[in-house]
């Protein structure tokens, strides 16, 4: 038994990192396989992480963690039964991959403009909490090529767009994700999407 | 309410051996590292010991290496410090102290102080 | 091992000043790991800030931390009769737990 593809791993910089390799056949994961992490830390304890299989010789596993800092560096051992098979390390602050927001609404009701809110998905306390930007994605049920993407460089969780930037009587759905710059992150994944209905008067024409 | 409670501290002679024994109480003691640091008569504080949550790490400051044992009993939630060839220099108030890892080693609960007197 | 040194020993100040407590580490640290403390004669110690700048449960919002590198300090915005006390700085690293030998401070 040998790993093909060595672990990697990301870190939502709050309580999970996930890491991920692969075997160089089938294997179950679960039965097979253990990843022990300990953090680079006086008197602190290693951790057992029951891998879950991710395709036939894909594993992967979520190391549980109490709360993270930029300084912490873990120690990462992958063991089948008595044998090591792979020995590393890895810094949670250099290999960020930040949580999806939550809670995304579509305010309908503010004269003809849409305010889209959703919440960050840090607690205050988080180091990434005053950190996150996002990217809004809203698209056409109707019209694949009705495709756009509002960066939101500022720090509050919503965007105000003109309603008549889209079309009328049409359905349109949004998602948003985040990433901060100060940890050079990966983008999160997409929000679940929310959809609603476009309507807005047509300006009056004179002819 | 969270506390350490110290206890096993006296008069002892040079050379001679003391046990002391910390209770904890509104916690689990198992999810913790815990430590002893110690403050000699009017001055500043000294780490002296520390073990892991399960036991199985250990930690000695080079002062007291050889001499000092640090040990915890989970089940019954108790932390000890088992010293022995003890010198005058070892006289102190002994501190048990609690570890919250998310603190990355800012000691949030500490017991009241024992005091060990070594002198003949 | 990194060694820790208080400036000043000690610091006369009155009710209603702001005191700025300074911590030297011999060698560049970890601000994750560096802690301070606040002890009243008679009593054990009570954790103030932790991982430089963050303050512990209950604490009040006059003090603060800060610093990086070598240089921490702790920042009492405007002191309190209470807060006359000793202050202690504290590194817990990969491998061992320094504490600074202390900063007394006094009402002048």
């Known amino acids: 038994m040998k790993v093909l593809q060595e672990p990697t791993c990301v870190s939502d910089y709050m309580s999970i990192s996930t890491c991920e390799w692969k075997m160089n056949g089938p294997t179950n994961c679960s039965t097979e396989l253990r990843l022990l992490y300990q953090l680079v830390f006086l008197l602190s304890e290693a951790h057992t992480c029951i891998p879950e299989n991710n395709g036939g010789a894909g594993c992967v596993c979520h190391l549980l963690m109490d709360d993270v800092v930029s300084a912490d560096n873990y120690t990462l051992d992958l063991w089948a039964g008595q044998q090591l098979l792979w020995k590393g390390s890895f810094k949670p602050s250099e290999h960020v991959k930040p949580r999806a927001p939550g809670n995304l609404t579509v305010h309908t009701n503010v004269s003809d403009t849409l305010l889209l809110t959703w919440s960050n998905p840090y607690p205050p306390d988080n180091y990434l909490y005053n950190h996150l930007t996002y990217a809004v994605n809203i698209w056409s049920e109707n019209d694949p090529a009705d495709f756009r993407i509002y960066n939101v460089t500022y720090l509050e969780p919503s965007l105000r767009i003109a309603a008549s930037t889209l079309k009328s009587g049409i359905s349109y759905r949004a998602r948003v994700r985040a990433w901060a710059q100060c940890y050079n992150t990966t983008w999160s994944e997409w929000s679940p999407s929310t959809k609603w209905h476009n309507s807005y008067r047509e300006p009056f024409e004179q002819h | 309410e969270v506390q350490l409670l110290e206890s096993g501290g006296g008069l002892v002679q040079p050379g001679g051996s003391l046990r002391l024994s910390c209770a904890a109480s509104?916690?689990?003691?198992?999810?913790?590292?815990m430590h002893w640091v110690r403050q000699a008569p009017g001055k500043g504080l000294e780490y002296v010991s520390g073990i892991s949550s399960n036991g199985g790490s250990t930690y000695y400051a080079n002062s007291v290496k050889g001499r000092f044992t640090i040990s915890r009993d989970n089940p019954k939630n108790t932390l000890f410090l088992q010293m022995s060839s003890l010198r005058a220099e070892d006289t102190a108030v002994y501190y048990c102290v609690r570890v919250k890892v998310g603190y990355r080693g800012g000691m949030d609960v500490w017991g009241q102080g024992t005091t060990v007197t070594v002198s003949s | 091992e990194t060694t820790l040194t208080q400036s000043p020993d000690t610091l006369p100040l009155s009710p209603g000043d702001r005191a700025s407590l300074s911590c030297r580490a011999s060698?560049?640290?970890?601000?994750?790991?560096l802690a301070w403390y606040q002890q009243k004669p008679g009593q054990a110690p009570r954790l103030l800030i932790y991982?430089?700048?963050r303050r512990a449960t209950g604490v009040p919002g006059r003090f603060s931390g800060s610093g990086s590198g070598t240089d921490f300090t702790l920042t009492i915005s405007r002191l309190e009769p209470e807060d006359f006390a000793v202050y202690y700085c504290q590194l817990y690293g990969s491998s061992s737990v320094t504490f600074g030998q202390g900063t007394k401070l006094e009402i002048k």
């Open positions: 060698q560049s640290v970890s601000s994750a790991y």
């Open positions: 509104g916690f689990t003691l198992s999810s913790y590292a």
């Open positions: 991982g430089t700048s």
